[in-house]
């Protein structure tokens, strides 16, 4: 059941997000999540994962990229990118926005 918490050994991760108590956290794995909300700049959050390991296997999209790793502070220097937006096939002579 992917919603059940992991009960394995805990790892220390860098924590940089609105959900962190302090600069590190302890969890089953470390995460980096890059999210772009509509009309806003992307924000990269680092933290700990204990639930929903299936998110780690998701493919990057133009709105979110989710990275997971399993060793001490392994998320500290990871930088993510979002999938490039696929522009619609342009007709010759039209202006792109």
């Amino acid at each position: 059941d992917p919603v059940k918490p992991s009960r394995g050994p805990l790892v220390t991760c860098t924590c940089e997000s609105p959900h962190c108590k302090g600069p590190t956290c302890r969890g089953a794995w470390c995460t980096v999540v890059l999210v772009r909300e509509e009309g806003r700049h992307p924000q990269e959050h680092r933290g700990c994962g204990n639930l929903h390991r299936e998110l780690c296997r998701g493919r990057p999209t133009e709105f979110v990229n989710h990275y997971c790793c399993d060793s001490h502070l392994c998320n500290h220097n990871v930088s993510l990118v979002l999938e490039a937006t696929q522009p619609p096939s342009e007709q010759p002579g039209t202006d792109g926005q």
Partner: antibody, heavy 113, light 110 residues
Framework: EVQLLESGGGLVQPGGSLRLSCAAS????????MSWVRQAPGKGLEWVAN????????NYVDSMRGRFTISRDNSKNTLYLQMNSLRAEDTAVYYC??????WGQGTLVTVSS | QSVLAQPPSASGTPGQRVTISCSGS????????VYWYQQLPGTAPKLLIY???KRPSGVPDRFSGSKSGTSASLAISGLRSEDEADYYC???????????FGGGTKLTVL
């Protein structure tokens, strides 16, 4: 869009009980720790309790431990606060918050005879 | 008496820069992140600063946070009338095993 909607507030007599609910939507509720924070009329913010993602860890402010119980039902995307032995000084707006960013609009609890 | 100490009031004129302080101890600000919230009259608190100095998307860069030792501060530059609100600092306290808030600072734009 993240939304937190509190309910269950109202007028209760000293010594009485209330159960507050907070319905969450717009995010994966089971991925986030949640808190209750209260604000007495004209006063500042006071943290009440929090609960981790799966409900296995709970923390309370000392003055409310034993009287208040925080819980959650991830299948219903709902956070709860059971409040017993209420006192006049518990009168406040009670906010549900996703740690530590989004807050609901609050529900008013008035303890008076 | 709040665990984190803030001045009860602050004021400034439009366009000015105003700073609000928040003083704590080694068990809260000294070892954990500082958060700042803005509460407009009659509304719920809104997150302004997290992780000492980071802004959530949508928060103007006129708002900035800093931390040194067991103290923190919120700076608001280019003050505007809509900034008139109550401002609260917060941090996790390892000794109390809970979240602590400052008493709030009422900002008046003159």
């Amino acid at each position: 869009e993240v939304q937190l909607l509190e309910s269950g507030g109202g007028l209760v007599q000293p010594g009485g009980s209330l159960r507050l609910s907070c319905a969450a939507s717009g995010f994966t509720f089971s991925s986030y720790a949640m808190s209750w924070v209260r604000q007495a009329p004209g006063k500042g913010l006071e943290w009440v309790a929090n609960i981790n993602q799966d409900g296995s860890e709970k923390n309370y402010v000392d003055s409310m431990r034993g009287r208040f119980t925080i819980s959650r039902d991830n299948s219903k995307n709902t956070l709860y606060l059971q409040m017993n032995s209420l006192r006049a000084e518990d009168t406040a707006v009670y906010y549900c918050a996703r740690e530590f960013d989004y807050w609901g609009q609050g529900t008013l609890v008035t303890v008076s005879s | 008496q709040s665990v984190l100490a803030q001045p009860p009031s602050a004021s400034g004129t439009p366009g000015q820069r105003v700073t609000i302080s928040c003083s704590g101890s080694s068990s809260n600000i000294g070892s954990n992140y500082v958060y700042w919230y803005q509460q407009l009259p009659g509304t719920a608190p809104k997150l302004l600063i997290y992780g000492n100095n980071k802004r959530p998307s949508g928060v103007p860069d006129r708002f900035s946070g800093s931390k040194s030792g067991t103290s923190a501060s919120l700076a608001i530059s280019g003050l505007r009338s809509e900034d008139e609100a109550d401002y609260y600092c917060a941090a996790w306290d390892d000794s109390l095993n809970g979240r602590v808030f400052g008493g709030g600072t009422k900002l008046t734009v003159l």
